[in-house]
């Protein structure tokens, strides 16, 4: 089987001339393409992967909402040679994007990372935007998180920052098959420079204090009962509240090495996507087709939006 292969971050990598073809390894009988688009009130971007896949042919479209950050996920798998270029990976212009002057700022101010690389979205480097209320929703919180897409033995991840409706969310996420949008929210001007280590404590909610059991018991029993602690708590704290509904997605540090495109362990190049870089061109039948005429992401109204944290 021969498939198209590319990895897109923001708007490079699946661009027209960068499309590759790869011969899939033995036993691989589907080509795959997956795209995840994230829409903030200040713009949108997408991540995408094309390559040799696994599983069965078919399509999966989903719309997700995380505190006013909208995510659209599409997966398409097919079993013919070079069939994995049917999804439109080009984004249409957002209504508010580029026209923010028409909206009244509500006083909140956040760092904005929309399609920026991890290097450009560190600390206070990214641009600052004024939040505004849109579509009857109040955007007064700031968000710091990641979008991650895994397909064709490749994982691509980009940071996401911007204005959201929630001001206190902690490590919240929404997921689709191989797709995760996760992060934390905060309140205050430019508070979303780095929320990786945000714990579940909130000024409005007193922390849950777990009292140590009486010391008459053997001390070794305490060490084994670690279910009440998680790695999400501050290093010196042994208490945290676990939110079972949230997606426990990794919230990659901007200070870590750039692992935005990761070839999964054990994956051979022939079995996955090759290439590097982000927005994709469209494929399809011969003939000049406008990108705007290609299949669109599911609209906000018609998209299936599961409960927060659901899949």
């Amino acid at each position: 089987l021969e498939c198209y292969s590319c990895v897109q971050k923001a708007d490079d990598g699946c661009s027209p001339h960068r499309m590759k073809t790869v011969k899939c390894g033995p036993g691989v009988d589907v080509c795959t393409e997956a795209v995840g688009a994230v829409e903030t009130i200040h713009g949108q971007f997408s991540v995408a992967v094309r390559g040799c896949g696994s599983g069965i042919p078919g399509k999966n479209d989903r719309g997700l909402d995380l505190h006013g950050l909208l995510a659209f996920f599409q997966l398409q798998q097919c079993s013919e040679d070079r069939c994995n270029a049917k999804l439109n990976l080009t984004l249409r212009g957002l209504n508010p994007a580029g026209n923010e002057s028409a909206y009244e700022p509500n006083g909140a101010e956040c760092y904005s990372c929309v399609g920026l690389s991890r290097e450009k979205c560190q600390g206070s480097m990214p641009p600052v935007v004024n939040c505004y209320n849109a579509s009857g929703r109040v955007y007064k919180g700031c968000f710091d998180g990641n979008v991650t897409l895994t397909a064709a033995n490749v994982t691509v991840s980009l940071p996401v920052r911007g204005c959201v409706q929630d001001e206190t969310c902690t490590r919240d996420g929404v997921t689709g098959p191989g797709f995760t949008l996760s992060g934390s929210c905060c309140q205050g001007p430019r508070c979303n420079a780095d929320l990786r280590n945000k714990t579940y404590f909130s000024p409005r909610i007193p922390p849950l204090v777990l009292l140590p059991p009486p010391t008459t018991a053997a001390p070794s029993t305490r060490a084994q009962n670690s279910s009440s602690t998680t790695s999400t708590a501050a290093p010196t704290t042994t208490t945290s509240i676990i939110k079972p509904t949230t997606a426990q997605a990794s919230h990659t540090s901007p200070h870590e090495m750039d692992l935005e495109v990761i070839q999964e362990e054990g994956a051979s190049l022939s079995g996955g996507a090759a290439g590097h870089g982000g927005t994709a061109g469209h494929g399809g039948a011969a003939g000049h087709q406008d990108r705007s005429n290609m299949e669109k992401y599911p609209g906000k109204g018609g998209a299936q939006i599961p409960a927060k944290g659901g899949s």
Epitope: D11, H17, K20, T21, R291
Partner: antibody, heavy 117, light 112 residues
Framework: EVQLLESGGGLVQPGGSLRLSCAAS????????MSWVRQAPGKGLEWVSY????????YYADSVKGRFTISRDNSKNTLYLQMNSLRAEDTAVYYC??????????WGQGTLVTVTS | QSVLTQPPSASGTPGQRVTISCTGS?????????VHWYQQLPGTAPKLLIY???KRPSGVPDRFSGSKSGTSASLAISGLRSEDEADYYC???????????FGGGTKLTVLG
Amino acid sequence: EVQLLESGGGLVQPGGSLRLSCAASGFTFSNAWMSWVRQAPGKGLEWVSYISSSGSTIYYADSVKGRFTISRDNSKNTLYLQMNSLRAEDTAVYYCAREGLWAFDYWGQGTLVTVTS
Amino acid sequence: QSVLTQPPSASGTPGQRVTISCTGSSSNIGAGYVVHWYQQLPGTAPKLLIYDNNKRPSGVPDRFSGSKSGTSASLAISGLRSEDEADYYCAAWDDRLNGPVFGGGTKLTVLG
């Protein structure tokens, strides 16, 4: 109908500057990657520069790096090429081209840039 | 010197089949990047003839076909006509140069 119309070419002295424009119509410009490609008289095609749909990703050929700047104004459906420190070897017909279907699927008619003293 | 190598000229008589080769390297065609072909009629802008190795845009006759193998590609024109007299260029992305590269072009002459 897709149309690309270049303008801004002309005669310039070595070391001088020119700004080329390419007005696009008949397609959603803000969704398209665009490039400049040039052709010296009697010679072959040479890719010059590439810009992504949003303008955030840009590539240049080594021969023009540091001297030429590609940009776009999606609100005006226009692609630009600012050419500084021009040399005699930059003399060519400059085409703007749309990237679609994984290739340059539409080209303008070209604008001639002549660098001579 | 062009990154992709094409013969400078090719010729044939009407009705004949002509093939133009395009040889690249491991950083372009050999890296798996798809190959495109352009036709440039005298005094006009180039026109896309074949994209994605072997696909024809609408309006391009099926006399034109493309193929790719390893680090090279070829364009075949069957049933040659006088209006096919033009320059033909191949193109592909190049990882080393981080941009699309063209062949030097092949001038096709239709004899007789």
